[in-house]
Interface confidence: low
Amino acid sequence: HNTTVFQGVAGQSLQVSCPYDSMKHWGRRKAWCRQLGEKGPCQRVVSTHNLWLLSFLRRWNGSTAITDDTLGGTLTITLRNLQPHDAGLYQCQSLHGSEADTLRKVLVEVLADPLDHRDAGDLWFPGESESFEDAHVEHSISRSLLEGEIPFPPTS
C-alpha cells in the first residue's frame, strides 16, 4: 500500500477519507488505527458501529470520529482540534472476523497555526526525534508519498 499524506492545521479539524470497493467490503465494519513504529502493531483508535447497517452513524473516541458510507464506499475519519501529538502513521482498516484488511495507509502531518505566535513554518512529524527523508511537503490536503519516501525512518 502507498501512503497518503493528509495535512491539517493545529487546533483545527482534519478530515481523512479512505475510498474502498463497496462490493468487496460489503458487510464489513471499519476501523481507524495508529501504527506503532515501522513494524509495530496498529493500535485501534475508533471503529464503526457494531451493527454494520448503522455504520453511517458517527462514532467518537475522544477527539476522533469515524463514519462509513457503505454504499458509496468511503470511510471518513475526523480528527477534531488537531494537536502535534496526532501526527503519525495511521491505517484505515476493513474488519473481517479476526482479520483486518488495510484500505489505506495515512500519514497525518500537523502544520502550525499561522495565527499562532510560533514559527508559521513549523511542521510536526511523528516522534520527537524522528525525521523523514526528503518529505517533499506540498501545501495540499492530501498526497501520496513519493517513491523512495518512507513513513518511518530506517532503524539501525
Epitope: D21, M23, K24, W26, G27, R28, R29, N50, W52, G97
Partner: antibody
Amino acid sequence: QVQLVQSGAEVKKPGSSVKVSCKASGYAFSSSWMNWVRQAPGQGLEWMGRIYPGDGDTNYAQKFQGRVTITADESTSTAYMELSSLRSEDTAVYYCARLLRNQPGESYAMDYWGQGTLVTVSS
Amino acid sequence: DVVMTQTPLSLSVTPGQPASISCRSSQSLVHSNRYTYLHWYLQKPGQSPQLLIYKVSNRFSGVPDRFSGSGSGTDFTLKISRVEAEDVGVYYCSQSTRVPYTFGQGTKLEIK
C-alpha cells in the same frame, strides 16, 4: 446464468507444478471473491485460498502458503490456481467456487462451483 | 483455524423419515457485523458440492423447503423433515466468518 468451467484433468510428476484454470461467465467476475477448494480421493473438502479479481487481493490457507499462487485475468474472466512442489498427497479434485453475495452483508457462501479438475501426482 | 466437527459421520434413513446433522465450531462464528457465516453444502455422488443453506438458516434458491438450518454461536443443526432418495450424498457444514474458511468432515446420508 452463472457458469464456472475448469480446465481438464492433469497427470504430474512429483516436484513439478500444475496450473488449473477456471473460466467464469454470467456474473460480474471482478467483484466477487473466487475460492479454490480441493478434495483428495474419498476425503472431505479443504479450502486452499481465494482471490478478489478486482484488485488481485489474495488469502491462502497456512498449509499451502508458499506453494500455491492464485491469480485472475479480468480480461478473460478467468481465475488460476498454481500449485508447486507437487507430492503424491496433492492428488485430488480441485474446485473453483465463487462467493455468493446477499445484501445486507455478504453471505460468504460458495454458491457456484466448477465441475472440478482431477490432478494426479504420480512418478 | 476454526475447527468444524460434525455428528454423526454417517446415517441411514428410511424415505419419508426426518434426519438431523449437528455441527459444532471450535469458536464462535458470529462476525463483527453480527452475521453468522455458517453454511451447509451437499455433495451428491460424482458431483461438485452444492450450496443448501447459507448464513445458518437461509435456503439457497431451488433448495426444497424440507431442508432447514438453525443454531447460533458454536452449535448448528441441519434438518431434513422428510428424506427423499435424491438427498443421498455427503453433507458438509462450513464457516466463512474467519479466514481460512474451514469445513466439517462430512456426514454421509444413505437411504435404508
